[in-house]
């Protein structure tokens, strides 16, 4: 019986190929050149090894590359990738969008996993900030991501970057991370005129002041109440009534079905009756 | 510094009215920003919102409770009043004062004062 | 009325334990949604407003987070004064409703 750990005679693998899929574990590890693995890496997506040959082929990088892969091999990790911890996934350096992109792919259609989200917090925080092209690409892979990220991680968004937001991105954001995006927000679209500007600020007015609020009023925007809803609560607590039907347009008659509900209720409780009565939708302060 | 403090009686018969009052101390019962609300808890249970009131006298009661419960204020004395008809044993709780700042939730309680409702 | 249910009702745990308590609401409320600690004999306390807020005076351990109908409190690492229960409460809708409550016991 050969010895386990010696690879038995004519089976040292020349080249990364099917032919590896009969191998057994031991064989594989006494048979596969690391460094044959690494430069092949593209092969292995092809070959339908089993998750313990996988393992094995995971063990073989780790021991080549203790201190993290190189990107040339990461960059072609296919389904490997989904074989990686987070603490794994901690030494890496992958600048390459090209790279994100590959190995996003590959968990394509399942939520974030640990691994995906170490590896986008190591890409993010190896380029500085997250731009234009690296929120394109996570948004894409992942809708909700924007909103995953804490205030603090959201201040390094420069405002070319938020043309890049879709409403859907905005979605499950919560009023502190509106707090942040807003401002950036109305940096980025500073140049559009008032009904293209509406468009394009209106999924981040949840973090939109008061003075803010009274300006889009004059501009005839006809914010619809799904909008109004998401307005944060102490923006809307001083508009006058008149502003409030400026600024809803038609829709101010979608009041009503809301006016037990935050922030209506709050803005209708703090309104003069007589005021409301203006409405004439039976609003009771 | 803001604080609340309930007062009123520990014992009520059943079929009787019970009647509470918060003080408002270190602050104002007419501020824009809050409302004051009545919040019970029947003992080993949870918490129960009964309704609040503003300033202005507007008032919002728990459905459930809304046919027994009238909730006053009293701006010039710096207190709000509960007011909780045709009690029967199931009332007996420990009943709270509460403000409700606008941008945040129940964010000062008074001490709470135990009813118990029995003849 | 909005019913909002949490879970688990209660829970054993050690100091240093990282403790997660979910609350659900019967339908969306947007971010209005608030958490109290109660500890025996005491009123409520405001930890967490609007989901995520963390109210001035409470410790960073205490985390909240979520946003429609699914939220989640947070103690990164519990001591020994947040053995106490927990309570949701929903502000959306002027029938403001509460949780059930989930009491952290020490393990």
């Known amino acids: 019986e050969v010895e386990k750990t010696a690879c038995p005679s004519g089976k040292k693998a020349r080249e990364i190929d099917e032919s590896l899929i009969f191998y057994k574990k031991w064989e594989l590890e006494a048979c596969v050149d690391a460094a044959l693995l690494a430069t092949q890496m593209d092969r292995v997506n092809a070959i339908p090894f089993t998750y313990e040959q996988l393992d094995v082929l995971k063990h073989k990088l780790d021991e080549l590359y203790p201190q993290g892969y190189p990107e040339s091999v990461i960059q072609h990790l296919g389904y490997l990738f989904l074989k990686m911890s987070p603490e794994d996934i901690r030494k890496w350096n992958v600048t390459s969008l090209e790279t994100l992109k590959a190995l996003l792919e590959v968990n394509k259609g399942h939520e974030m996993s640990p691994q995906v989200a170490t590896l986008i917090d190591r890409f993010v925080k190896g380029r500085g900030q997250l731009d234009k092209d690296t929120l394109d690409t996570l948004t894409a892979f992942y809708p909700g991501y924007l909103c995953s990220l804490s205030p603090e991680e959201l201040s390094s968004v420069p405002p070319s970057s938020i043309w890049a937001v879709r409403p859907q991105d905005l979605d499950t954001c919560d009023p502190r991370q509106l707090d942040v995006l807003y401002p950036k927000a109305r940096l980025a679209f500073q140049n559009m005129n008032g009904s293209e500007y509406f468009v394009k600020i209106q999924s981040f007015l949840g973090g939109a002041p008061t003075e803010d609020l009274k300006a889009l009023s004059q501009q005839n925007v006809s914010m619809d109440l799904a909008t109004f809803m998401k307005l944060r609560t102490d923006a809307v607590l001083p508009l006058t009534v008149a502003e409030v039907q400026k600024l809803l347009g038609p829709h101010v008659e979608g009041l009503k079905a809301e006016e037990r509900h935050r922030p209506v209720r709050d803005w209708i409780l703090r309104q003069r009756q007589d005021d409301l009565d203006t409405l004439g939708l039976g609003l009771q302060g | 510094q803001v604080q609340l403090q309930e007062s009123g009686p520990g014992l009520v018969k059943p079929s009787e009215t019970l009647s509470l009052t918060c003080t408002v101390s270190?602050?104002?019962?007419?501020?824009?920003?809050?409302?004051w609300s009545w919040i019970r808890q029947p003992p080993g249970k949870g918490l129960e919102w009964i309704g609040y009131?503003?300033?202005?006298?507007?008032?919002n009661y728990n459905p459930s409770l809304k046919s027994r419960v009238t909730i006053s204020v009293d701006t010039s004395k710096n207190q709000f009043s509960l007011k909780l008809s045709s009690v029967t044993a199931a009332d007996t709780a420990v009943y709270y004062c509460a403000r409700d700042f606008v941008l945040s939730g129940f964010d000062i309680w008074g001490q709470g004062t135990m009813v118990t409702v029995s003849s | 009325d909005i019913q909002m249910t949490q879970s688990p009702s209660s829970l054993s745990a050690s100091v240093g334990d990282r403790v997660t308590i979910t609350c659900r609401a019967s339908q969306s409320i947007s971010s209005y949604l608030n958490w109290y600690q109660q500890k025996p004999g005491k009123a409520p306390k405001l930890l967490i407003y609007?989901?995520?807020s963390l109210q001035s005076g409470v410790p960073s351990r205490f985390s909240g987070s979520g946003s429609g109908t699914d939220f989640t409190l947070t103690i990164s690492s519990l001591q020994p004064e947040d053995f106490a229960t927990y309570y949701c409460?929903?502000?959306?809708?002027?029938?403001?409703?509460f949780g059930g409550g989930t009491k952290v016991e020490i393990k």
């Open positions: 009131i503003y300033y202005s006298g507007s008032t």
């Open positions: 609007a989901a995520s």
């Open positions: 270190g602050g104002s019962v007419s501020s824009f920003t809050d409302t």
């Open positions: 409460q929903q502000s959306y809708d002027a029938s403001y409703t």
